[in-house]
Amino acid sequence: LIIGFGISGRHSITVTTVASAGNIGEDGILSCTFEPDIKLSDIVIQWLKEGVLGLVHEFKEGKDELSEQDEMFRGRTAVFADQVIVGNASLRLKNVQLTDAGTYKCYIITSKGKGNANLEYKTGAFSMPEVNVDYNASSETLRCEAPRWFPQPTVVWASQVDQGANFSEVSNTSFELNSENVTMKVVSVLYNVTINNTYSCMIENDIAKATGDIKVTESEIKRRSHLQLLNSKAS
């Protein structure tokens, strides 16, 4: 928890942020909450970014005040006006860019006082993997595909039956650059798989960790995917 100390007779108010990650090309949320205040007209929300001269966003007297907004954020930011009433100053950032990564400050003024908190925002690409049986291969083979990752992730296979086994010798992973020349498609193939076993394809970089599971039996195939953002901590 970071508390901004008030000056000139105003009290400090508690402002809380959560470190988060943005998926490039998609919309992201920079989370910030503060002590709600009944006098809505006095609430000022300012978002600033370290190393950027202009403001990221300003919300003042009930509306966006974007005259001081930095060019790099023009037309890409919004606060949730109805959520401001309950102390939510989170910022929606449209079309996240790699260059949006950095340290942001959420600065709040209310009739009760002032406060601020910093937030580390990481950017990259992450997507859910899908694991399928590769019927074109000569032996029983699994193919794990995830369309967008950046930076380049690691891929590790695991199995429920052979826990702790190292599958690096019987797997092959490739990274194919996507058309925008930043993100990459991840393809990993696992050979010599056995029936009645659950296999997991785990893809991880410093932003996210994703897992694709497949259970192959003689009668059916069951799949499950899970994606988790890393380093989402409050301050």
């Epitope: 002590e35 709600p36 009944i38 006098k39 006095d42 109805d82 009433i85």
Partner: antibody, heavy 116, light 107 residues
Framework: QVQLVQSGAEVKKPGSSMRVSCKAS????????ISWVRQAPGQGLEWMGG????????NYAQKFQGRVTITADKSTSTAYMELSSLRSEDTAVYYC?????????WGQGTLVTVSS | EIVMTQSPASLSVSPGERATLSCRAS??????LAWYQQKPGQAPRLLIY???TRATGIPARVSGGGSGTEFTLTISSLQSEDFAVYCC?????????FGPGTKLEIK
Amino acid sequence: QVQLVQSGAEVKKPGSSMRVSCKASEDTFSSYAISWVRQAPGQGLEWMGGTAPIFGTTNYAQKFQGRVTITADKSTSTAYMELSSLRSEDTAVYYCARGGPYFDYWGQGTLVTVSS
Amino acid sequence: EIVMTQSPASLSVSPGERATLSCRASQSVSSNLAWYQQKPGQAPRLLIYGASTRATGIPARVSGGGSGTEFTLTISSLQSEDFAVYCCQQYKNWPFTFGPGTKLEIK
């Protein structure tokens, strides 16, 4: 002195609509949200929804969604709450209040009786 | 929605004594909690907001405490005008929700 002045008591038939007004001072209207809270006889308080003219936003409790409409007339600093398809369970005292998030000033309340 | 519960439903205390009322939220509401007093035939009156900040004109013998899911309202040295219904309200999330109230009666 902050004052919220509500319209008078009403008796309504089931299936009809009701409309309660709440006149506030100009600074209340331009700086605060106005919420509507009801209280059925012998029961607790129930938040129905609210409007923040300064933000241009209105929120409703899920229970009343589709049946309640809250509006604000900035020119007269008056908020209105309309509830349709009335039933006997809607018999209550309806309050307007300054806020959310919490409510520091309240209207005197308007008793609405729904009876055939 | 966040469900607010209060205990006890009613409380009998002698004038001059202390009364402690409890309010519980079904999930954390941080310190986003208010307390109101209501007398028969009257509109509610704000006592406490932010779990512990007294509203304008509220005497120091009224105090609020707690955070997260457990909250208390304490009235020390009860006076005749304190006997009323007290209810809590969370404003962490929409919709705002109230507790059912605690009736404070003269013993």
